[in-house]
């Protein structure tokens, strides 16, 4: 399988980790989150050509069938393979609380 | 979050399990698999509108940012949440072997 740097579609076009800066307003969190005011959201973006970061056998099957009938079977999709935790300071009825979220920031990506 | 039957885009258009019939030739397996000759491949296909089968907080963030900058951040993607095992009868140097694959057939789907 191709590794993360060997993108046949051109530099940066294949599935990889991107960082998108977002405010609490952007995320719809302004009502319940105090901090951070801005989040560096890491997410998985990019195309998944044949064998590129294929997560498993299912991804390989999907590529094969996508090539036969692309209007029926989509190409594999670039999604998080794992996550980094993130702590949010939240508003509560009595004040504030610290909450850790384990499924918020992508850590690395694969195609499935 | 919306459940699997409440698709705002119209019946059957949102993320759900589909079955696609595929031959060994379609899958590129004819050289190494003896049986089955044809596979009923279950896979996750469909759109992921806001909150539809959102897998986690990351999916919700992705929806929010996709609405703000759709050319930069793609919508969440319909992918397997779990898999069903499948047994393949494979050709070997000495004859045949039975091999179970745990990551071949999607069992149910979510958006991420």
């Amino acid at each position: 399988a191709r590794n993360g740097d060997d993108c046949p579609l051109g530099p940066g076009r294949c599935c990889r980790l991107h960082t998108v800066r977002a405010s609490l307003e952007d995320l719809g969190w302004a009502d319940w989150v105090l901090s951070p005011r801005e989040v560096q959201v890491t997410m998985c973006i990019g195309a998944c050509p044949s064998q590129f970061r294929a997560a498993n056998m299912h991804a390989q099957i999907k590529t094969s069938l996508h090539r036969l009938k692309p209007d029926t079977v989509p190409a594999p999709c670039c999604v998080p393979a794992s996550y980094n935790p993130m702590v949010l300071i939240q508003k509560t009825d009595t004040g504030v609380s610290l909450q850790t979220y384990d499924d918020l920031l992508a850590k690395d990506c694969h195609c499935i | 979050a919306r459940n699997g039957d409440d698709c705002p885009l119209g019946p059957g258009r949102c993320c759900r399990l589909h079955t696609v019939r595929a031959s060994l030739e379609d899958l590129g397996w004819a050289d190494w698999v003896l049986s089955p000759r044809e596979v009923q491949v279950t896979m996750c296909i469909g759109a992921c509108p806001s909150q539809f089968r959102a897998a986690n907080m990351h999916a919700q963030i992705k929806t929010s940012l996709h609405r703000l900058k759709p050319d930069t951040v793609p919508a969440p993607c319909c992918v397997p949440a779990s898999y069903n095992p499948m047994v393949l009868i494979q050709k070997t140097d000495t004859g045949v072997s039975l091999q179970t694959y745990d990551d071949l057939l999607a069992k149910d789907c979510h958006c991420i």
């Epitope: 046949p8 579609l9 051109g10 998944c48 050509p49 044949s50 009938k69 029926t72 190409a75 | -």
Partner: antibody, heavy 121, light 106 residues
């Protein structure tokens, strides 16, 4: 801008073979699948097959298996189709057409001008 | 393979008229794509994924349909629209084209 350049015409003898070229420019050659399509005089379009230049994957219409062979030369961003054992039935215009397999559903986005093949003794 | 049947084979219309051409599939397809071809030229993508106009296509064109029946509509036909129009599917292997509708302007 994207361009697919094909020779205008080829005159070939029955029983021989011909290799048609399609030179791509204006995009990353390995990022688009390349289709080949046949059009006989005053007739419709018939899909021959495709090649993915990123890994040389090919896929042929059953009607053209054994007739057409698709290859690419990524160093020159050129796709080729060889047609063998030519007969008068192979006289047609042959188009190459690029296709973005990662923005589906989509159409065949860019087409060459076509090569007119005439099979005659 | 899926057979696409286009009707009518030849369509004659006067400038300003609304015209509709149809593409019927032998089995259900998810999307239909349309191409325009003028004599001596290569086909051009015209409508993709049933209803999306390709770049540069005038807004008087539209596409619709689902399942086995799809249409290309021109709200007010113009002289420059004279051409052959082909439908194409790739929901099933192999991709197939319809036989074409030739639009003539009176």
């Amino acid at each position: 801008q994207v361009q697919l350049q094909q020779p205008g015409a080829e005159l070939v003898r029955p029983g021989t073979s011909v290799k048609l070229s399609c030179k791509a420019s204006g995009y990353t050659f390995t990022s688009y699948w390349m289709h080949w399509v046949k059009q006989r005089p005053r007739q419709g379009l018939e899909w021959i097959g495709l090649i993915d230049p990123s890994d040389n994957y090919t896929n042929y219409n059953q009607n053209f298996k054994g007739k057409a062979t698709l290859t690419v030369d990524t160093s020159s961003s050129t796709a080729y189709m060889q047609l063998g054992s030519l007969t008068s039935e192979d006289s047609a215009v042959y188009y190459c057409a690029s296709y973005d397999g990662y923005s589906t559903p989509s159409a065949m986005d860019y087409w060459g001008q076509g090569t007119s093949v005439t099979v005659s003794s | 393979q899926i057979v696409l049947s286009q009707s009518p084979a030849i369509l004659s219309a006067s400038p300003g008229e609304k015209v509709t051409m149809t593409c019927r599939a032998s089995s259900s397809v998810n999307y239909m794509h349309w191409y325009q071809q003028k004599p001596g030229s290569s086909p051009k993508p015209w409508i993709y994924a049933t209803s999306n106009l390709a770049s540069g296509v005038p807004a008087r064109f539209s596409g619709s349909g689902s399942g086995t029946s799809y249409s290309l509509i021109i709200s007010r036909v113009e002289a420059e629209d004279a051409a052959a129009y082909y439908c194409q599917q790739w929901s099933s292997y192999p991709p197939t084209f319809g036989g074409g509708t030739k639009l003539e302007i009176k």
